[in-house]
């Protein structure tokens, strides 16, 4: 939870809690307003004092997941619980005690109170991670030329500062071609068009007067090796459709070099599916480059029995060709219940 000084409580979600399901004792000065947020969400959270749920109006109220005390009085001291509605699990367990003098900042304890210029009470706290789930990917192995973003979203009071280190040394990107992008409000470091010399350990150091935290990322830059297009396995997929329906065949293409894509339908000429050269007879249905909007989807509208057959996604670049095929089966309308889709396909590669 946090004790807030924001004037924007009704519009912004509560900051992330410092510690959940932990008992905490806070000392509040006589007459101070108190505003406590329960977790990251205002929904489904209720405040209780000494076992009784707080009303949503009045001098002391539980409202939208917040505990608000207009002006702290001796009788407001006591034990407060924030419970999740439904499960009734304890989200926060908090004891407020009164002190008739404002506390001084105790550097040993990140949970002491101070007074803001507006008179609202708020929590002095050491830095903490607000979105640790965004920091789970420690190793970033990326192809050369890509953009890399490291982030260490944090909070604290006073608001912490963030500094970045590369291999243990202060990092400002001055020696890096293209420099770096630091967004302090998003606690992020961005490097565009990475090169092998960007490899290393990147550490964010977040600190304020009450403490510091750090986290390290590992960056490996993979040098690109030229290759023919790679087609995602299983696509296009064998598909069964009903006469009159619409069909989409999907082909996912990965290629460093600019790929050229064709959708082909295998056809029969003079009773044969193959020419004298051993190559299949095909009809080109669609030709495109990968950066147009629908490059990898073949749309077949209002299919008929004649549309049944083998379809191939052919992708080529300066290195070579790759292709994968799938079969479309078209059923009469009365057999609609039998329609299904499977995801098997053949893959072939040629240089």
């Amino acid at each position: 939870f946090s004790l807030e000084a924001s004037e924007e409580m009704e519009q912004e979600p509560c900051p992330a809690p410092i510690s959940e399901q932990q008992e905490q004792v806070l000392t509040v000065a006589l007459g101070q307003p108190v505003r406590l947020c329960c977790g990251r969400t205002e929904r489904g959270r209720h405040w209780y004092k000494e076992g009784s749920r707080l009303a949503s109006a009045g001098r002391v109220r539980g409202w939208r997941g917040r505990l608000e005390i207009a002006s702290f009085l001796p009788e407001d001291a006591g034990r407060y619980l924030c419970l999740a509605r439904g499960s009734m699990t304890v989200v926060h367990n908090l004891t407020l005690i009164m002190d008739d003098s404002l506390p001084s900042i105790n550097n040993e304890d990140p949970k002491t109170l101070s007074s803001s210029s507006s008179g609202h009470s708020y929590l002095q706290q050491a830095p903490y991670w607000t979105h640790p789930q965004r920091m789970e990917k420690k190793l970033h192995a990326v192809p050369a030329g890509n953009t890399v973003k490291f982030r260490c979203p944090a909070a604290g009071n006073p608001m912490p500062t963030i500094h970045w280190l590369k291999n243990g040394q202060a990092f400002h990107g001055e020696n890096r071609i293209g420099g770096i992008r630091l967004r302090h409000q998003h606690w992020s470091l961005v490097m565009e068009s990475v090169v092998p010399s960007d490899r290393g350990t990147y550490t964010c150091l977040v600190e304020n007067s009450l403490g510091s935290i750090r986290y390290s990322y590992l960056l490996d830059v993979l040098e690109r090796s030229p290759h023919r297009p790679i087609l995602q396995a299983g696509l296009p997929a064998n598909t069964t459709a009903v006469v009159g329906s619409n069909v989409e065949l999907l082909c996912k293409v990965y290629s460093d070099a600019q790929p050229h894509i064709q959708w082909l339908k295998h056809i029969v000429i003079n009773g044969s599916s193959f020419g004298a050269d051993g190559f299949p007879y095909v009809q080109v249905l669609k030709t495109t480059d990968i950066n147009s909007s629908e490059v990898e989807v073949l749309y077949l509208r209002n299919v008929s029995a004649e549309d049944a057959g083998e379809y191939t996604c052919l992708a080529g670049n300066s290195i070579g060709l790759s292709y994968q095929s799938a079969w479309l089966t078209v059923l009469p309308a009365e057999e609609e219940d039998l329609a299904w889709t499977t995801a098997t396909s053949e893959a072939r590669y040629t240089d």
């Epitope: 924001s6 004037e7 912004e12 979105h131 990326v142 890509n146 973003k149 302090h184 409000q185």
Partner: antibody
């Protein structure tokens, strides 16, 4: 409630200049990064520029780099976009948008102001 | 810059249909992807942020999924007010590029 109101659009000749403003209310302006996003008639959205809450960071789309300047006056709760060397392809509705905290999602948008570059 | 490719560019659907729109990034963008809805003459509206988080006030029939390069916006049961243009937007790189849009029309 949060409100963003753009102004300053209009008709300008190629090579001319224009300054757009975005008046913000209903939130602590200096706490939020702000962006400009534009939309040419009948086309999709194109991000133009961003500025941090304290003005310490700015960034621009390649298409406007060197011609447009984003700025803000937190004492007036106002965001600006100075547009110089305007081209026909800059013709668009320009929106100002607020970024969510900890993310770059635009959670509030203005109604837009139309900039027409034509001789 | 990171390129964002949406598909399809347009689709026709009926009220009650389940609709899926996909967005692909030209490189890994983690979960730094947002989805917007725009109706004619109006400003865009944020639906989903960071790939899968529903923006406050947005109906629960909208959902987002994906990470890395492939992302999906799903409308579980299309309502009359959902006919609009939908855009994805990446914010992994400093230039926050949008997809070209997907127009959802009435069948």
């Amino acid at each position: 409630q949060v409100q963003l109101l753009e102004s300053g659009g209009g008709l300008v000749q190629p090579g001319g200049s224009l300054r757009l403003s975005c008046a913000a209310s209903g939130f602590t302006f200096s706490d939020y990064a702000m962006s400009w996003v534009r939309q040419a008639p009948g086309k999709g959205l194109e991000w133009v520029s961003v500025i941090e809450g304290d003005g310490s960071y700015t960034h621009y789309a390649d298409s406007v780099k060197g011609r447009f300047t984003i700025s803000r006056d937190n004492s007036k709760n106002t965001l600006y976009l100075q547009m110089n060397s305007l081209r026909a392809e800059d013709t668009a509705v320009y929106y100002c948008a607020r970024e969510k905290t900890y993310s770059s999602a635009f959670d509030y948008w203005g109604q837009g102001t139309l900039v027409t570059v034509s001789s | 810059d990171i390129q964002m490719t949406q598909s399809p560019s347009s689709l026709s659907a009926s009220v009650g249909d389940r609709v899926t729109i996909t967005c692909r990034a030209s490189q890994d963008i983690s979960s730094d992807l947002n989805w917007y809805q725009q109706k004619p003459g109006k400003a865009p509206k944020l639906l989903i942020y960071d790939a899968s988080n529903l923006q406050s006030g947005v109906p629960s029939r909208f959902s987002g999924s994906g990470s890395g390069t492939d992302f999906t916006l799903t409308i579980s049961s299309l309502q009359p007010e959902d006919f609009a243009v939908y855009y994805c937007q990446q914010h992994y790189s400093p230039s926050h590029t949008f997809g070209q849009g997907t127009k959802v029309e009435i069948k």
